[in-house]
């Protein structure tokens, strides 16, 4: 008789999840020789322990603590790039600008990027059929709690000028409910962070509006200013040209506004 299984609204655990996490860990430690000391089996065991046999709507930051203490690494605190709803461009940028880091350029972020996972209460099985959706099912699911936990600590590490890439094509360019808006903004340390600089990425080719005047950007400025952190904003009208100019800053066309 097949065992009854809770049906959630979100997609199930990414196929070959354990193998993927372990392989990513090994790859990361090979790419970053300073991380050679990391024991990837211990990392996987700690990751697995956070959600296996636990109700996927009852996950806490506490569950991830054994994982959170692993993989200590050095990220220059003045080279942190946050992003919201524009991950691909942010990652393309740090692939070119190698001295800047998104959360997904760190070990824990790299392990979990684009993956989904959850378990089931009282069984050691991974649920490959469905996992809770943040809106439709519950917010305390394994994936959401993981990103909240690592995002908080990443933001706490930032100093000097912190950059954030925002998607100018969305109705809410700054969304208070995003991980950036609900976690990272509130965990920047005012005694260390001097300025938050927003880069608003334009979508349309002919879009010449100043999206830094958008009401949601003004809302972000207000939140940041109240935390005694300065705020600045730049329009990136041509993201393709922007990336090209990061690659080749000497190019004559890169002196004009991008």
């Amino acid at each position: 008789v097949p065992r009854w299984r809770q049906q959630w609204s979100g997609p199930g655990t990414t196929k070959r999840f354990p193998e993927t996490v372990l392989a990513r860990c090994v790859k990361y430690t090979e790419i970053h020789p300073e991380m050679r000391h990391v024991d990837c089996q211990s990392v996987w065991d700690a990751f697995k322990g956070a959600f296996i046999s636990k109700h996927p709507c009852n996950i806490t930051e506490e569950d991830y603590q054994p994982l959170m203490k692993l993989g200590t690494q050095t990220v220059p605190c003045n080279k942190i790039l946050l992003w919201s709803r524009i991950k691909d461009l942010a990652h393309q940028f740090t692939q070119v600008q190698r001295d800047m880091f998104t959360l997904e350029d760190t070990l824990l972020g790299y392990l979990a990027d684009d993956l989904t996972w959850c378990g089931e209460f009282n069984t050691s099985k991974i649920n490959y059929q469905s996992c809770p959706d943040w809106r439709k099912d519950c917010s305390n699911n394994p994936v959401s709690v993981f990103w909240k936990t690592v995002s908080r600590r990443f933001a706490e590490a930032a100093c000097d000028v912190v950059h954030v890439m925002l998607n100018g094509s969305r109705s809410k360019i700054f969304d208070k409910n995003s991980t950036f808006g609900s976690v990272e903004v509130h965990n920047l340390q005012p005694e260390k962070v001097q300025t938050l600089e927003a880069w608003v990425i334009h979508g349309g080719r002919e879009d010449s509006r100043d999206l830094c005047q958008d009401p949601t950007i003004k809302e972000l400025e207000s939140i940041i200013s109240k935390r005694n952190i300065q705020f600045s904003c730049k329009n990136i009208y041509r993201p393709d040209k922007f990336l090209q100019c990061v690659k080749n800053p000497e190019d004559s066309s890169c002196t004009s506004e991008i």
């Epitope: 300073e34 603590q65 959170m68 203490k69 200590t72 050095t74 990220v75 605190c77 600590r153 706490e156």
Partner: antibody, heavy 120, light 108 residues
Framework: QVQLQQSGAELARPGASVKLSCKAS????????MQWVKQRPGQGLEWIGA????????TYNQKFKGKATLTADKSSNTAYMHLSSLASEDSAVYYC?????????????WGQGTSVTVSS | QIFLTQSPAIMSASLGERVTMTCTAS???????LHWYQQKPGSPPKLWMY???NLASGVPPRFSGSGSGTSYSLTISSMEAEDAATYYC?????????FGGGTKLEIK
């Protein structure tokens, strides 16, 4: 603002014990190792041990096993160090310090220190 | 266990002078995990530099760090009065941790 507030100076007799506290604020206490460091007058820094409040994991410098006992109370965001069988060589300033996860394990915030004097 | 030896133990420099102090490890250390602290009398140490060359928040840009393997250094391009202090190097490792013996920098 991140702060580590340590308890006040202690004067103790040889053979006695003391419990020092370090109250953390301004960050998520659970997700950072808390380190303890000893400094004798006019001397350098000596590592005692560390505790990870998130899961209670503890690691000690072999030299201080049996001398120092580390604990943490997550509900009050406070780390403790119990020093037993005090002797004159335990007279020192003891610091708690937070290990910065993205700072390569460097100690990015320090308490003001607690002075322990052992004297008969 | 890796030991860190700092040299010189004590040094003095005139205002405006370039200052370099070294930290030598008994065996190779990853540059990502070699850190420096500044301590002044009566105060706790302060994180000064992390991962060999990254300045901690608020540290003046006249400070720089370099090195790899077993040899690391902290340099002040132009000594200022407020730089007089003791500097400790430190190697991160889960256990045991090690600090160097310190270099005391005085004003000549």
């Amino acid at each position: 603002q991140v702060q580590l507030q340590q308890s006040g100076a202690e004067l103790a007799r040889p053979g006695a014990s003391v419990k020092l506290s370090c109250k953390a604020s301004g960050y998520t206490f659970n997700t950072y190792w808390m380190q303890w460091v000893k400094q004798r007058p006019g001397q350098g820094l000596e590592w005692i041990g560390a505790i990870y409040p998130g899961d209670g994991d503890i690691t000690y410098n072999q030299k201080f096993k049996g001398k120092a006992t580390l604990t943490a109370d997550k509900s009050s965001n406070t780390a403790y160090m119990h020093l037993s069988s005090l002797a004159s060589e335990d007279s020192a300033v003891y610091y708690c310090a937070r290990e910065g996860y993205y700072y390569g394990g460097a100690l990015d915030y320090w308490g003001q220190g607690t002075s322990v004097t052992v004297s008969s | 266990q890796i030991f860190l030896t700092q040299s010189p133990a004590i040094m003095s420099a005139s205002l405006g002078e370039r200052v370099t102090m070294t930290c030598t490890a008994s065996s190779s250390v990853s540059s990502s995990y070699l850190h420096w602290y500044q301590q002044k009398p009566g105060s706790p140490p302060k994180l000064w530099m992390y991962g060999t060359s990254n300045l901690a928040s608020g540290v003046p840009p006249r400070f720089s760090g370099s090195g790899s393997g077993t040899s690391y250094s902290l340099t002040i391009s132009s000594m200022e009065a407020e730089d007089a202090a003791t500097y400790y190097c430190h190697r991160y490792h889960r256990s045991p941790w090690t600090f160097g013996g310190g270099t005391k920098l005085e004003i000549k």
